[in-house]
Amino acid sequence: PPRGRILGGREAEAHARPYMASVQLNGAHLCGGVLVAEQWVLSAAHCLEDAADGKVQVLLGAHSLSQPEPSKRLYDVLRAVPHPDSQPDTIDHDLLLLQLSEKATLGPAVRPLPWQRVDRDVAPGTLCDVAGWGIVNHAGRRPDSLQHVLLPVLDRATCNRRTHHDGAITERLMCAESNRRDSCKGDSGGPLVCGGVLEGVVTSGSRVCGNRKKPGIYTRVASYAAWIDSVLA
């Protein structure tokens, strides 16, 4: 099943997020992703845990997963590079770089997103945008079109409380509020965008969604700048 969902959000403006990618397994949406360079998509390492025998592809330029759109194109993956320290049983280092079989054809609906290189926390309360094609309610309804939601960043101390994520949130992770509006598993790999810059990637660890005591967890890309640069080089 697809990993992730946007809860309490709404349909995104079509093609207003040209960096948005759908990471697909055997032709079905699996995870979100974000175009960070012409030939590279950033996603979450856990997304490919169960994909050993399947065909992984990346859909760019899409708003609807099913309808024909002039900007839509499915790319094969030349190389999948999970972060070397990512492990199945932790949320740490949950990043994956996918090299497309060729450079993406750029245009109004397909464009890389600048990503944060300055390793400094986003101020608590900052509203950030997260988007994805994950299920939109607890009944499991899957959207065909891209959904998004604005979420306030939550300070790490609150996220680390025993009743929240009990000390698991390292300096390389960040949190956003999850009170009925939330990202979750299936939006895993998708972008958390603050002020037009990629700040976080939705982690793909399992957790309840939409519960304010279990905030959304995002991998801070600035903390992994050296690794991203080394892979893209």
């Epitope: 608590p124 300070d155 790490r156 101390a157 609150t158 680390n160 409380r161 025993r162 009743t163 009990d166 000390g167 698991a168 949130i169 300096e171 309840v208 519960n211 005591k213 279990k214």
Partner: antibody, heavy 116, light 112 residues
Framework: EVQLQQSGPELVKPGASVKISCKAS????????MNWVKQSHGKSLEWIGD????????SYNQKFKGKATLTVDKSSSTAYMELRSLTSGDSAVYYC?????????WGQGTLVTVSA | DVLMTQTPLSLPVSLGDQASISCRSS???????????LEWYLQKPGQSPKLLIY???NRFSGVPDRFSGSGSGTDFTLKISRVEAEDLGVYYC?????????FGAGTKLELK
């Protein structure tokens, strides 16, 4: 290595106030709530309250409202607890403890003795 | 407030014995998020409390596997399979689910 270093023992007169400190090291101070716990001589432990070092937001045990005031100084990674209008019932060891999955890290304790 | 009642208050043991300490809460300490924040601490004379168990049954890093926690709802137990000299001290149960957070009165584990 996470360390919480508390200020030294205090001998104070009834009715006076005292401010004790807890200096954190070995982690990012703003990443965890700081809690304070009281232990009267030979007695159990009582939770006083907690503080979010990011914004100074506090939560108190109703029993200690008006008695204890929690503050932080982010620049020095130090948490403070002020106790006012002291009586003999406030004589105790006071601990700071960092919150995570639990109270895994504690200061060594500060003994406050209230005596005329 | 949630009252945490520990029994016994004193537990005389011989080295190598099994020891069992009970902790009962006056109401359920299952948090609204579904987790149960029941912890066990050991305090030796002149020292700060040390964490042994969190979330009912999870041993903190470095805690020997002779310590185990169990229970649910309102009834919890700490077991020490073979008591060693370094285990002597006062054991406290603690609930972190409801404010104010509360500790039990303590159980003193001592030699017979």
């Amino acid at each position: 290595e996470v360390q919480l270093q508390q200020s030294g023992p205090e001998l104070v007169k009834p009715g006076a106030s005292v401010k004790i400190s807890c200096k954190a090291s070995g982690y990012t101070f703003t990443d965890h709530y700081m809690n304070w716990v009281k232990q009267s001589h030979g007695k159990s432990l009582e939770w006083i309250g907690d503080i979010n070092p990011n914004n100074g937001g506090t939560s108190y045990n109703q029993k200690f409202k008006g008695k204890a005031t929690l503050t932080v100084d982010k620049s020095s990674s130090t948490a403070y607890m002020e106790l006012r209008s002291l009586t003999s019932g406030d004589s105790a060891v006071y601990y700071c403890t960092r919150e995570g999955a639990s109270f895994a890290f504690w200061g060594q304790g500060t003994l406050v003795t209230v005596s005329a | 407030d949630v009252l945490m009642t520990q029994t016994p208050l004193s537990l005389p043991v011989s080295l190598g014995d099994q020891a069992s300490i009970s902790c009962r809460s006056s109401q359920s300490i299952v948090h609204s998020n579904g987790d149960t924040y029941l912890e066990w601490y050991l305090q030796k004379p002149g020292q700060s409390p040390k964490l042994l168990i969190y979330k009912v049954s999870n041993r903190f890093s470095g805690v020997p596997d002779r310590f185990s926690g169990s229970g649910s709802g309102t009834d919890f137990t700490l077991k020490i399979s073979r008591v060693e000299a370094e285990d002597l001290g006062v054991y406290y149960c603690f609930q972190g689910s409801h404010v104010p957070l509360t500790f039990g009165a303590g159980t003193k584990l001592e030699l017979k």
